[in-house]
């Protein structure tokens, strides 16, 4: 069983491996994993006080 690399992820990392649909690349573990879709809520009606918090669709199980 191999150990994961300990170098910083992100901007300096090589381009992630393409993942199949319904997966995305997780820079933390350097692996394609099941992914849900981020979604932004519908705008509140005019006059609403504060913007609704952003939420997400659950990943497919």
């Amino acid at each position: 069983m191999r150990r994961g690399p300990r170098s910083l992820r992100g901007r300096d990392a090589p381009a992630p491996t393409p993942c199949v649909p319904a997966e995305c690349f997780d820079l933390l573990v350097r692996h394609c994993v099941a992914c849900g879709l981020l979604r932004t809520p519908r705008p509140k009606p005019a006059g609403a006080s504060s913007p609704a918090p952003r939420t997400a669709l659950q990943p497919q199980e």
Partner: antibody
């Protein structure tokens, strides 16, 4: 329903070994990464190790490297933490957790969404 | 390793108060920060991920903001069930690291 159940904790003498199990249901562990996080009595959370069960890739906190081994059996949908050469400072509640991901520009926007109930490991003579 | 420093370490507040907890990363972690709530004897519960996204089922009085090195968790109107300890965590790079926690107590 997603559920994680840890077992295997207990009292062990310094230098001894324990094997913790994390049985998952409601999802397939090979689709996610599984993490162990511990919490010493009265202290904060400390990440211990992670595994991507689909390929067995792992990583460890420096404090446990060379002593602990994380593994997974995808046929049993279960992750494990083998703990050897235990020390008093390893005394803690050990949690397993699933890391969930949502698609974003940088790949995964993720966090640990489901946690087990925890299992207490006490290292004492 | 990236250090996550939370402040304050504890605070006293009343029901209905607006509460703000901050977390500072020792280096840029983009928006790869989550917030958790933990009550005594229980496992942590996810509140916020990717700095500002509310996790499913979490009340909308919780919100998160920030990017880079400075992050904030806000409870807009504290409820009795919100008295707990809150942790930030970065997952920009391994090892993922937690803040030391902020205990929210009843005034």
């Amino acid at each position: 329903e997603v559920q994680l159940v840890e077992s295997g904790g207990g009292l062990v003498q310094p230098g001894g070994s324990l094997r913790l199990s994390c049985a998952a249901s409601g999802f397939t562990i090979s689709s996610n990464s599984i993490h162990w996080v511990r919490q010493a009595p009265g202290k904060g959370l400390e990440w211990v190790a992670w595994i991507t069960p689909s390929d067995g890739n792992t990583d460890y906190a420096d404090s446990v490297k060379g002593r602990f081994t994380i593994s997974a059996d995808t046929s049993k949908n279960t992750a494990y933490l083998q703990m050897n050469s235990l020390r008093a400072e390893d005394t803690a509640v050990y949690y397993c957790a699933r890391r969930v991901c949502y698609s974003s520009v940088r790949g995964c926007a993720g966090a640990m969404d489901y946690w087990g109930q925890g299992t207490l490991v006490t290292v004492s003579s | 390793d990236i250090q996550m420093t939370q402040s304050p370490s504890s605070l006293s507040a009343s029901v209905g108060d607006r509460v703000t907890i901050t977390c500072r990363a020792s280096q840029d972690v983009s928006t790869a920060v989550a917030w958790y709530q933990q009550k005594p004897g229980k496992a942590p519960k996810l509140l916020i991920y990717s700095a500002s996204f509310l996790y499913s089922g979490v009340p909308s009085r919780f919100s998160g903001s920030g990017s880079g090195t400075d992050f904030t968790l806000t409870i807009s109107s504290l409820q009795p069930e919100d008295f707990a300890t809150y942790y930030c965590q970065q997952s920009y790079t391994t090892p993922p690291t937690f803040g030391q926690g902020t205990k929210v107590e009843i005034k």
